[in-house]
Interface confidence: low
């Protein structure tokens, strides 16, 4: 989905900005896990129907899908169960939160409250520690990409009820030893760090005793630093084309960025004759503008009832905080002239024609073009 | 100050076509799904639609699908109702209705167009 | 679709008395989804009170909504001259949304 925030006015008062679901959670949990996704509603009021979809497909209840109107809970999590996890308002389909899962072998990490391994009452008068869950605890090295959240569990049992405590690198590991501080769950014999930053990599222990002894494991964390990219336009994408007068046309830009990008359709543009600035850069219009919450965004600029105006030189623009990607095409428009057009009414969505052609508004783009509102323009028909 | 205004008072003959509009303003209207809500006289509430002016997606309750068309410039901060051939029935006052954010209820409401259908 | 029923459909009153109205739902509406308007003649309708009983901004405390399932109330705990008006609720969790067709509540 994505938020569409057309800027043909620069310059405008700033509007009061609606709230926008979150970013992208990233999030890790281990194999046979249970994933479990929270998603509140904005202001902590109620919150409309909603339905949870994961890869673009809605989920389906059952015994271990538990799916509920701001919570979803997967039990015995695979490597099928990884992907991108949505909540949406069931009838407008408005993504609300989005998370991206990610399943690994790994003992585990995420932050899951599925309460499973609570101490249990084994029927055993007394007894030292011993792990309820070993088999979860194969997998002693945990690699996660930056900014993720990590758990460990050392789901443990015992008479009387051990107690357990957490080493970083052989010594007592506290909150105040992170930024971002950790979460303890006791009950959940587990140790949570969200957001992982590489400061966080190590050898986490955990510490399993009562008065009859004493267990440990000791877990390794590397934390993969991201190197971000400046987005890619796929090669080949859009591509120039040719268009009969009065027929529609629809370009393609295919964009991938890890980081969230700002896209935008851009027009080439003559004002006063001219198609540079005094300064020598071109002015351009923007048609489009959103902000993509994929990391992968096929995105459409379709022109309806094309004219001669709508020939011309195009942009698709990606922008991310690393840089600007962006491909230039051609759009040319030929055969039997149109009547005279008509002058279209501005109520009429799509097609409002300025009278004069001044420049109302100027704002520098990335130090390479001059950004005009459409108003001072010809405006094109699209949709 | 969300604000959302509609246009004036129509009188039309029946076969013609009419649209009306609703401006908002104070809140990013791309980002608020717009609701038409149908009020004949001396009756209740009935929905007809919703339209989302980022991309113009709409949802069209079944009773009124095919019957009228929503559509939005979100250049201009406008969504439309339109009819393209109007009938007696039509008469009725039309408000439209900004949902709140999480797209459920009526939150900000405008304050109608009465349209009359009259030969 | 969601049939709701309101009930009673006129409701007679004296400011500072207490204001008891229903809305019936033909099946369950889940999760209390569920919303109440007021519309003052000539007026355009006004959120009240969504989620079945989360008052909205602005809203004062004497309006209150309950309920859930099938059957909901909204409670005006006591008449101010200014709530003399027709009341509608709203359910929005299964399309088509649908209103209840009123009930007016006016000065005895």
């Known amino acids: 989905e994505s938020l569409g925030t057309e800027q043909r006015v620069v310059g405008r008062a700033a509007e009061v900005p609606g709230p926008e679901p979150g970013q992208q959670e990233q999030l890790v949990f281990g194999s046979g896990d249970a994933v479990e996704l929270s998603c509140p509603p904005p202001g902590g009021g109620p919150m409309g129907p909603t339905v949870w979809v994961k890869d673009g497909t809605g989920l389906v209840p059952s015994e271990r899908v538990l799916v509920g109107p701001q919570r979803l809970q997967v039990l015995n999590a695979s490597h099928e169960d990884s992907g991108a996890y949505s909540c949406r308002q069931r009838l407008t389909q408005r993504v609300l939160c989005h998370f991206s899962v990610r399943v690994t072998d790994a003992p585990s990490s995420g932050d899951d409250e599925d309460g499973e391994d609570e101490a249990e009452d084994t029927g055993v008068d007394t007894g030292a520690p011993y792990w309820t869950r070993p088999e979860r605890m194969d997998k002693k090295l945990l690699a996660v990409p930056a900014a993720n959240t990590v758990r460990f569990r050392c789901p443990a049992a015992g008479n009387p009820t051990p107690s357990i405590s957490w080493l970083k690198n052989g010594r007592e590991f506290r909150g105040e030893h992170r930024i971002g501080g950790i979460k303890l769950r006791h009950q959940q014999w587990s140790l949570v760090m969200e957001s992982v930053v590489p400061s966080d990599r190590g050898n986490y222990t955990c510490v399993v005793e009562n008065k009859f002894g004493s267990i440990r494991q000791t877990y390794t964390l590397d934390v993969l630093e991201r190197s971000p990219h400046r987005p890619i336009l796929q090669a080949g994408l859009p591509a120039n084309q040719t268009a009969v007068l009065g027929s529609d046309v629809e370009f393609h830009c295919k964009v991938y960025s890890d980081a969230q990008p700002h896209i935008q359709w851009l027009k080439h543009v003559e004002v006063n004759g001219s198609k540079v600035g005094p300064d020598g850069t071109p002015y351009v219009t923007v048609l489009k503008s959103w902000i993509s919450e994929s990391v992968e965004a096929d995105v459409r600029l379709r022109l309806a009832n094309v004219s001669e105006r709508d020939g011309g030189e195009y942009l698709c623009r990606a922008t991310n905080f690393i840089g600007v990607a962006e491909k230039a095409f051609w759009l040319s428009v030929h055969g039997p002239r149109a009547a005279e057009e008509e002058l279209v009414e501005a109520d009429e969505a799509g097609s409002v024609y300025a009278g004069e052609q001044k420049l109302i508004s100027e704002e520098d783009l990335g130090g390479e073009q001059k950004l005009i509102s459409e108003e001072d323009l010809h405006h094109h028909h699209h949709h | 100050e969300v604000q959302l205004v509609q246009s004036g008072a129509e009188v039309k003959k029946p076969g013609e076509s009419l649209k009306i509009s609703c401006k908002g303003s104070g809140y990013s209207f791309t980002s608020y799904w717009i609701a038409w809500v149908r009020q004949m006289p001396g009756k209740g509430l009935e929905w007809m639609g919703i339209i989302y002016p980022g991309d113009s997606d709409t949802r069209y309750s079944p009773s009124f699908q095919g019957q009228v068309t929503m559509s939005a410039d979100k250049s201009i901060r406008i969504a439309y109702l339109q009819w393209s051939s109007l009938k007696a029935s039509d008469t009725a006052m039309y408000y439209c209705?900004?949902?709140?954010?999480?797209?459920?209820?009526?939150?900000?409401w405008g304050q109608g167009t009465l349209v009359t259908v009259s030969s | 679709e969601i049939v709701l029923t309101q009930s009673p459909g006129t409701l007679s009153l004296s400011p500072g008395e207490r204001a008891t109205l229903s809305c019936r739902a033909s099946q369950s509406v889940s999760s209390s989804y569920l919303a109440w308007y007021q519309q003052k003649p000539g007026q355009a309708p006004r959120l009240l009170i969504y989620?079945?009983?989360s008052r909205a901004t602005g809203i004062p405390d004497r309006f209150s909504g309950s309920g859930s399932g099938t059957d909901f109330t909204l409670t005006i705990s006591r008449l101010e001259p200014e709530d003399f008006a027709v009341y509608y609720c709203?359910?929005?969790?299964?399309?088509?949304?649908?209103f209840g067709q009123g009930t007016k509540v006016e000065i005895k």
């Open positions: 989620g079945a009983s």
């Open positions: 209705a900004r949902l709140d954010y999480s797209g459920s209820w009526f939150d900000y």
């Open positions: 709203q359910q929005y969790g299964s399309s088509p949304w649908t």
